[in-house]
Interface confidence: low
Amino acid sequence: RSDQEPLYPVQVSSADARLMVFDKTEGTWRLLCSSRSNARVAGLSCEEMGFLRALTHSELDVRTAGANGTSGFFCVDEGRLPHTQRLLEVISVCDCPRGRFLAAICQDCGRRKLPVDRIVGGRDTSLGRWPWQVSLRYDGAHLCGGSLLSGDWVLTAAHCFPERNRVLSRWRVFAGAVAQASPHGLQLGVQAVVYHGGYLPFRDPNSEENSNDIALVHLSSPLPLTEYIQPVCLPAAGQALVDGKICTVTGWGNTQYYGQQAGVLQEARVPIISNDVCNGADFYGNQIKPKMFCAGYPEGGIDACQGDSGGPFVCEDSISRTPRWRLCGIVSWGTGCALAQKPGVYTKVSDFREWIFQAIKTHSEASGMVTQL
């Protein structure tokens, strides 16, 4: 881990699942004192770190489990807990007289389970390399990409669901393969689509404002997690995009603007471009809104394209000690494909963390097309 990438201030131990929070005043790691709100604290901690949810939580005793390099405790203000999305806002140093602290197992994400060392200028990828990538198919034809957040939730772009494509029984989610034609992939139906109510083209077809291009697809049943099917992590709370960082976009979209879709999943490494640069007159001239970002090369040549829409733009980091891939962007729009000074434009996922968590909690039983602001 480089000096530019410090550890995230909330960590979960891979050894015994203890939750640890960094005390920046003291420069030490503290344990979270057990309370009646353990379930909520575990969930919030996992979400803060970029995991989708806590799977289980438990209580450990410092006398038997040991301090393991931590010193002291944080206690949670249970009165303020229901009104926050940030654990760090509701904790303070305390004694924790019982010596019992919180452990949680978060839903794993962003890691390949195989030993593996639409995209213009990209290359074919190999099975298990991007195990969160799915294909969204309407009437059997690939229309959009998507990213698995769990076995049964896929994050994609709102624009993949115009009025003409809203018969949910005709959608399928294809996962676990890199060849569109693979007989080995798994295919599931769709129970619900939750799209962002602030995506203006759905209200006004003439709108050129593409902010909030985000949607969640709830599968009719969960995909089994295998070597080839794994969820991606979300950005951690407060984690900013790093201009110039090279990340990866994947998809089965067109390999040229007027070309055919790729039969095999493509991957391309492209750098993040600052919004200041991307809003320049020679780039997109103020069309890049705060909840979007650009990625690509000023000279063009490598980019996402039609059919990659909704697919993942992922960046790897080690802020959770273990290297993990995080879904930083969703392929949204662009002028042409791989043109000079017209990079791909992506939905900035970090700005929709709360929208995602809220949608999943609120609409897990919903059916059909659902909108959420």
Partner: antibody, heavy 118, light 106 residues
Framework: QVQLQQSGPELVKPGASVKVSCKAS????????INWVKQRTGQGLEWIGE????????YSNEKFKGKATLTTDKSSNTAYMQVSSLTSEDSAVYFC???????????WGQGTSVTVSS | ENVLTQSPAIMSASPGEKVTMTCSAS?????MHWYQQKSSTSPKLWIY???KLASGVPGRFSGSGSGNSYSLTIRSMEAEDVATYFC?????????FGGGTKLEIK
């Protein structure tokens, strides 16, 4: 190896129902859809519908809605198709077939002959 | 419903002869699949994703096409190729089969 073993031939009276079974082995039953296909003597193939055992989600050919009912029993790795209100038009060989990710049916049962006769 | 029309309905070829049969779709499809069925047996997946040979299929078979028009070709007819061949599309519901091409040997 992947195998789909179907139940034996049936001779049934008009107006009755018949339930054909398809026992899967050699793969994870819940990971693939099971399709059902009809073939009348000397005729072509007709897709009846498919069922995904993991969730029991079903996609059916409108033509067979109300005629064929698809179910599965995950504990025995078996798919079933019940055909009701039988007429001579339902006399056919019925196949189950495993559906792979791209809709191609890669493994087929041996077929079950259903004859409707009074 | 996407109607698949196969032609010819029946054809015969001499051993060693090149054979081509076609399948026309009323609506464009992403991929076409082909099945071989011999009398009184189950169909077998023969060609999938338009051009890929299923396991155990001899290399003299090939498939091609796009959009609405697809074909299956046998480079050099052999006696064991006598069968009925069905095209099949899975690009839209309901899934549909062609009426079949019955291939006989002269």
């Amino acid at each position: 190896q992947v195998q789909l073993q179907q139940s034996g031939p049936e001779l049934v009276k008009p107006g009755a129902s018949v339930k054909v079974s398809c026992k899967a082995s050699g793969y994870t039953f819940t990971d693939f859809v099971i399709n059902w296909v009809k073939q009348r003597t000397g005729q072509g193939l007709e897709w009846i519908g498919e069922i995904y055992p993991r969730s029991n989600s079903i996609y059916s050919n409108e033509k067979f809605k109300g005629k064929a009912t698809l179910t599965t029993d995950k504990s025995s790795n078996t798919a079933y198709m019940q055909v009701s209100s039988l007429t001579s038009e339902d006399s056919a060989v019925y196949f189950c077939a495993r559906g792979s990710g791209d809709y191609a049916m890669d493994y087929w049962g041996q077929g079950t002959s259903v004859t409707v006769s009074s | 419903e996407n109607v698949l029309t196969q032609s010819p309905a029946i054809m015969s070829a001499s051993p060693g002869e090149k054979v081509t049969m076609t399948c026309s779709a009323s609506s464009s499809v992403t991929y076409m699949h082909w099945y071989q069925q011999k009398s009184s047996t189950s169909p077998k997946l023969w060609i999938y994703d338009t051009s890929k040979l299923a396991s155990g299929v001899p290399g003299r078979f090939s498939g091609s096409g796009s959009g609405n028009s697809y074909s299956l070709t046998i480079r050099s007819m052999e006696a064991e190729d006598v069968a009925t061949y069905f095209c099949f599309q899975g690009s839209g519901f309901p899934l549909t089969f062609g009426g079949g091409t019955k291939l006989e040997i002269k």
